[in-house]
């Protein structure tokens, strides 16, 4: 029968009995955290053939092979993955081999087999027969192959029973254990599966079948299963479910989420029975099982019980994630925070409508309000005392409200109030009056011209660039020398630059008053010669990358009619030149006949330009005589089994270092020091390992139910 919706077996090995009648697990299978070594020989689940999501094994003491538990597991579909993986075997202290000798197909996702101190028979499995792409597989920190002495069936008796394939230029026998070969179908079957007797299955079968060319005899289906038959698509009036079977409307209508209300059943959309309408669609009415497209972002109405939602941290902003209409009032009070502008944009950036008022006070961390990037309407249904629906008070670093060239905001009812915002120019406030339609509503004291913008360069002159020169990783720019009325007031210039794939950046993007800034900054001193134009060489840039650049003059706070004069340029977009691409990734070669090689690769991670073609070079290599030097089948040649510690293997040198000519003298050579790129790759690898381990722990360690 079908079991689901994911089975988690932990702490007690007897819970395995839950798998007794399962033929398909509709969901994942976790077997983990069984710390007492048990005898698993009496547990066998021959009925289980398919897992639709992923299989995760973690810290199960005493389990030595999976072959006895799941002798007929044939397909792991990977419909949902565990951190990009469909098979995860992690820290299995006693596992000696995987042994899933009937596993023929992992439809989606990669495998991660890591930190299994006693695990062998990894190099004898050809994963390319099971997965479409092996480049993302991660097999690290297991028992070193040379300590395993993996022998496929019949090798010792010189009557090898298994077939050979080539992996990494090594042509060898393929097996799961000392007595189980890896099954391969005849080449005549092409991509099709085959029976135990090597007869080709029906094209709709996946993994295996009990009779040839019969779509009712499949062990698993390539596409969908319906009423005992494997079908390429679900028949009329049936719907895809969980990526593998077809169900009728009645079935879909009867699916529940444990916490759902009556109006929140599953929906039918695009031929699929699913939990929610996909992104960009909304239910066609509260009781409906069908979805219709949203106009613009899908509406999500959020309401605050206490009418006013105070945003004083990222955590409080998080509650508004995805909201497009906020019923109530927003009080923004952000005094400090890390990377606050982009965090707020992430959680509040979809809000389009606020039904009440918006009040921003004591938010010293804010430089701009652009994090409310979709706000288009403040209804002002509820107003502050004095009839204010937009109130901005004492924000010491606020410099920009919004980019009014690209912003349409309407305040339907109520007035605006601005006071004690020393870096906010009054011209910016006046511009907001015009755009929002509030001009004429404010009385004289509502916009204070003395304490708004008192410490800002409000009357800006424009700096003009005079020249730009680019190379693959450098940009040289010069600009007109700015001449304020008193030249002594000009101190220096600051150049701001950052990568900008699109020409849509603003000065305040990602910037807050707590030091977070998405722009790189470089100070440029004034050239001593008054006639030389100031300029800068920006280096260490990426090839074939568009950068945004602007320049600001740093001036003394020279007061002129209560305001400071300053100067800055427009934002300039410049692309660096193309360069040589990095090397193509994951190069694999295999022979499919005596006169052909098939070579596959992935594009380079850094194309550094538009790739137009690849060059493939090859040359004939002499046969490696070293392979014939030893009889690997004689017992004494199998290395002594040392117990691996499950840490990441570093290949130790067993022979004496080779003596070669080094530096003009004979003598033992030291290993070459690692290049910066190698060090960086190692660092990234270690980081990736940590991220995965954290993800694993966070996913599986859950509080005990009350």
């Amino acid at each position: 029968e079908i079991c689901g919706p994911g089975i988690d077996i932990r702490n007690d090995y007897q819970q395995l009995k839950r798998l007794e009648n399962c033929t398909v697990i509709e969901g994942y299978l976790h077997i983990l955290l069984i710390s007492k070594a048990e005898d698993y020989r009496s547990y066998r689940f021959p009925k289980l053939t398919v897992i639709t999501e992923y299989l995760l094994l973690f810290r199960v003491a005493g389990l030595e092979s999976l072959g006895d538990l799941f002798p007929n597991l044939t397909v792991i579909r990977g419909w949902k993955l565990f951190y990009n993986y469909a098979l995860v075997i992690f820290e299995m202290t006693n596992l000696k081999d995987i042994g899933l000798y009937n596993l023929r197909n992992i439809t989606r996702g990669a495998i991660r087999i890591e930190k299994n101190a006693d695990l062998c028979y990894l190099s004898t499995v050809d994963w390319s027969l099971i997965l479409d792409a092996v480049s993302n597989n991660y097999i690290v920190g297991n028992k070193p192959p040379k300590e395993c002495g993996d022998l496929c069936p019949g090798t010792m008796e010189e009557k090898p029973m298994c077939e050979k394939t080539t992996i990494n230029n090594e042509y060898n026998y393929r097996c799961w254990t000392t007595n189980r070969c890896q099954k391969m179908c005849p080449s005549t079957c092409g991509k099709r599966a085959c029976t135990e007797n090597n007869e080709c299955c029906h094209p709709e079968c996946l993994g295996s079948c009990s009779a040839p060319d019969n779509d009712t005899a499949c062990v698993a289906c390539r596409h969908y299963y319906y009423a005992g038959v494997c079908v390429p698509a679900c028949p009329p009036n049936t719907y895809r479910f969980e990526g593998w079977r077809c169900v009728d409307r009645d079935f879909c209508a009867n699916i529940l989420s444990a916490e759902s209300s009556d109006s929140e059943g599953f929906v039918i959309h695009d031929g699929e029975c699913m939990q929610e309408c996909p992104s960009g669609f909304i239910r066609n009415g509260s009781q409906s099982m069908y979805c219709i497209p949203c106009e613009g972002p899908c509406p999500k109405v959020c309401e605050e019980e206490k009418k006013t939602k105070t945003i004083d941290s990222v955590t409080s902003a998080q509650m508004l994630q995805g909201c497009t209409i906020f019923k109530g009032n927003l009080l923004i009070n952000i005094r400090r925070g890390n990377n606050i502008a982009s965090e707020l944009e992430n959680f509040m950036g979809l809000i389009e409508v606020v039904t009440g008022y918006v009040k921003i006070r004591h938010s010293h961390a804010l430089v701009s309000l652009s994090f409310l990037k979709n706000l288009r309407l403040i209804l002002g249904e509820e107003q502050l005392e004095g009839n204010y629906s937009f109130y901005v008070l004492d924000n010491q670093n606020l410099q920009q409200l919004w980019d009014w060239d690209h912003r349409n905001l309407t305040i339907k009812a109520g007035k605006m109030y601005f006071a004690f915002n020393p870096k906010l120019c009054v011209s910016e406030i006046y511009r907001m009056e015009e755009v929002t339609g509030t001009k004429g509503r404010q009385s004289k004291g509502d916009i204070n011209t003395r304490n708004n913008g008192e410490r800002a360069s409000c009357e800006s002159d424009v700096l003009h660039f005079t020249s730009t020169t680019t190379s693959k990783n450098r940009i040289i720019i010069t600009w007109h020398r700015y001449r304020p009325p008193d030249y002594r007031d000009l101190i220096s210039f600051t150049v701001y630059y950052k990568e900008a794939p699109f020409k849509n950046v603003t000065e305040y993007d990602g910037q807050d008053a707590c030091g977070s800034n998405s722009w790189n900054m470089v100070d440029v001193d004034l050239p001593p010669n008054k006639d030389v134009e100031p300029g800068i060489l920006l280096h260490g840039l990426k090839p074939w990358t568009q950068y945004a650049v602007y320049v600001k003059a740093v001036t003394l706070t020279m007061v002129e009619n209560d305001h400071i004069r300053g100067a800055k340029s427009e934002i300039l977009y410049i692309r660096t030149n193309a360069s040589v691409p990095s090397i193509p990734l994951d190069v694999l070669s295999a022979s499919n006949s005596s006169s052909q090689l098939i070579v596959k690769w992935n594009p380079p991670s850094l194309p550094n330009g538009n790739l137009s073609y690849y060059i493939v070079r090859w040359q004939r290599q002499p046969q490696d005589g070293y392979l014939y030097r030893h009889n690997y089948c004689s017992k004494d040649k199998i290395p002594i089994r040392k117990y691996a510690d499950g840490t990441i293997d570093i290949e130790e040198v067993t022979e004496n270092p080779k003596t070669e000519v080094c530096g003009g003298e004979k003598g033992p050579c030291c290993a070459c020091p690692k290049t910066e790129a190698e060090k960086q790759a190692e660092k990234e690898e270690a980081e990736y390992r940590k991220v995965f381990e954290n993800f694993l722990h966070n996913s599986i360690f859950v509080p005990r139910p009350e």
């Epitope: 079908i2 919706p5 009556d262």
Partner: nanobody
Framework: QVKLEESGGGLVQAGGSLRLSCVAS????????MAWFRQAPGKEREFVAT????????RYADSVKGRFFISKDSAKNTIYLEMNSLEPEDTAVYYC?????????????????WGQGTQVTVSS
């Protein structure tokens, strides 16, 4: 473990009514929903109705909609199946089932815990 015990089955005339009860005991906190399934002689076990434990949301098979009603009494850890307008085709062994799943489908393999069943016979 969750233990389930059904009662209330019996013989009834077509058009009559019956009320089945199912009491849950043991680790009842690990249950998110409960359901009734039935199995007629020589047939597969089929879904009848389900109810979620927290919100009390219900779902019914098309064949029983409007005639059968599932309900719960949280204080007594009990669910009920009120069966009206019974037909001879409703004759079966009725099983109570419980699940700890976050998503519950009418598939019987989604239910971890089962009762022994109670016989309902509808005579014409």
């Amino acid at each position: 473990q969750v233990k389930l015990e059904e009662s209330g089955g019996g013989l009834v005339q077509a058009g009559g009514s019956l009320r089945l009860s199912c009491v849950a005991s043991g680790r009842t906190f690990s249950r998110t929903a409960m359901a009734w399934f039935r199995q007629a002689p020589g047939k597969e076990r089929e879904f009848v109705a389900t109810i979620t434990w927290n919100s009390g949301t219900t779902r019914y098979a098309d064949s029983v909609k409007g005639r059968f009603f599932i309900s719960k009494d949280s204080a007594k850890n009990t669910i009920y199946l009120e069966m009206n307008s019974l037909e001879p085709e409703d004759t079966a062994v009725y099983y109570c089932a419980a699940t700890a799943a976050a998503v519950i489908t009418p598939t019987r393999g989604y239910y971890n815990y089962w009762g022994q069943g109670t016989q309902v016979t509808v005579s014409s």
